[in-house]
Amino acid sequence: IWELKKDVYVVELDWYPDAPGEMVVLTCDTPEEDGITWTLDQSSEVLGSGKTLTIQVKEFGDAGQYTCHKGGEVLSHSLLLLHKKEDGIWSTDILKDQKEPKNKTFLRCEAKNYSGRFTCWWLTTISTDLTFSVKSSRGSSDPQGVTCGAATLSAERVRGDNKEYEYSVECQEDSACPAAEESLPIEVMVDAVHKLKYENYTSSFFIRDIIKPDPPKNLQLKPLKNSRQVEVSWEYPDTWSTPHSYFSLTFCVQVQGKSKREKKDRVFTDKTSATVICRKNASISVRAQDRYYSSSWSEWASVPCS
């Protein structure tokens, strides 16, 4: 058993049929010695008397809010949550495995630039009685500060018969140095509680590996005289790190016909313009990637050829 926060405790249980559970001793936070009784979840049933209560915690029915009273007055509370361990592995019932980029990926994170600001998100099919807390640091042995906001419900989707809920959180490294080579990874820790079940999830990454630029902006076409060719031009996204001479992007320009089966023409360039042939009913798309480090490509910015 360990204290999650004041008056909230997590009991770690090996979870298998007929498991013995954990013996837990609760102490009433009071100078009183006599006439103390204990109840669980405001039930009228008295579980025991005295300053301490010893319980055997085996299942969720044994978790909850234990209250000690004297003469009808509440003296203190202890909330017990359960953290299940099955076959030596902590349970991951609350969050959904996103399976990208690999199995057992529960948290996914992205950064639009090198400022030290990043967003993480996770998925669940649980709609209610669910809470999260997010902490982060750079490194774990001598951690440097990262400040995270509150996790919020950011999207709801219907997946077959199930509803899926996406939660997200924004974090900012307190003393970020965008141009510095990272040697220690960012650690993100998410505590999750559903009713009386506690779970925790972690992710570890370098900002450089989670970079995904915003799409190029101001994508424009300029027809070239007496030619089927057009000059495509665009700009760096506003959210990308500056100066662009140091934080450089490379671009992929694609001409795509109306039909997905049509052959795509692709051009790669470090410039912010390119000359391509604009076919009828086609569209031109441009996406960006860090020029010197192969992290994710941005989403496409697109304009129709006509």
Partner: nanobody, 119 residues
Framework: EVQLVESGGGLVQPGGSLRLSCAAS?????THWMYWVRQAPGKGLEW???????????????YYSDSVKGRFTISRDNAKNTLYLQMNGLKPEDTALYYC????????KGQGTQVTVSS
């Protein structure tokens, strides 16, 4: 066994106020989202407000239906296992049986308390 007992309803004039209470027992109140729902005469159940409490951060969030936003305030006292609904600027269309519930569809609810808004 889950018990939800509502109180505080009554007859009030338009523009008046009432405060409803719901005493909860038989479950861990602080880890549950709690709801007020209502049923007007001859109508179905309508969601009114939600209170979520984050035991990890100690923060409460509240959500309201458009019909009561700005007039009603949901709150909770986890130490007393009690949910409240402060209703101001009451209108005749707020007349209904008000239930405290443990889910938004009202499957797990109390016996209700009647609110009548009439001059």
């Amino acid at each position: 066994e889950v018990q939800l007992v509502e109180s505080g309803g009554g007859l009030v004039q338009p523009g008046g106020s009432l405060r409803l209470s719901c005493a909860a027992s038989g479950f861990t109140f602080s880890t549950h989202w709690m709801y007020w729902v209502r049923q007007a005469p001859g109508k179905g159940l309508e969601w009114v407000a939600t209170s979520t409490f984050n035991i990890l951060t100690g923060t409460e969030n509240t959500y309201y239906s458009d019909s009561v936003k700005g007039r009603f305030t949901i709150s909770r006292d986890n130490a007393k296992n009690t949910l409240y609904l402060q209703m101001n600027g009451l209108k005749p269309e707020d007349t209904a049986l008000y239930y405290c519930a443990r889910d938004s569809s009202g499957n797990l609810k109390g016996q209700g308390t009647q609110v009548t808004v009439s001059s």
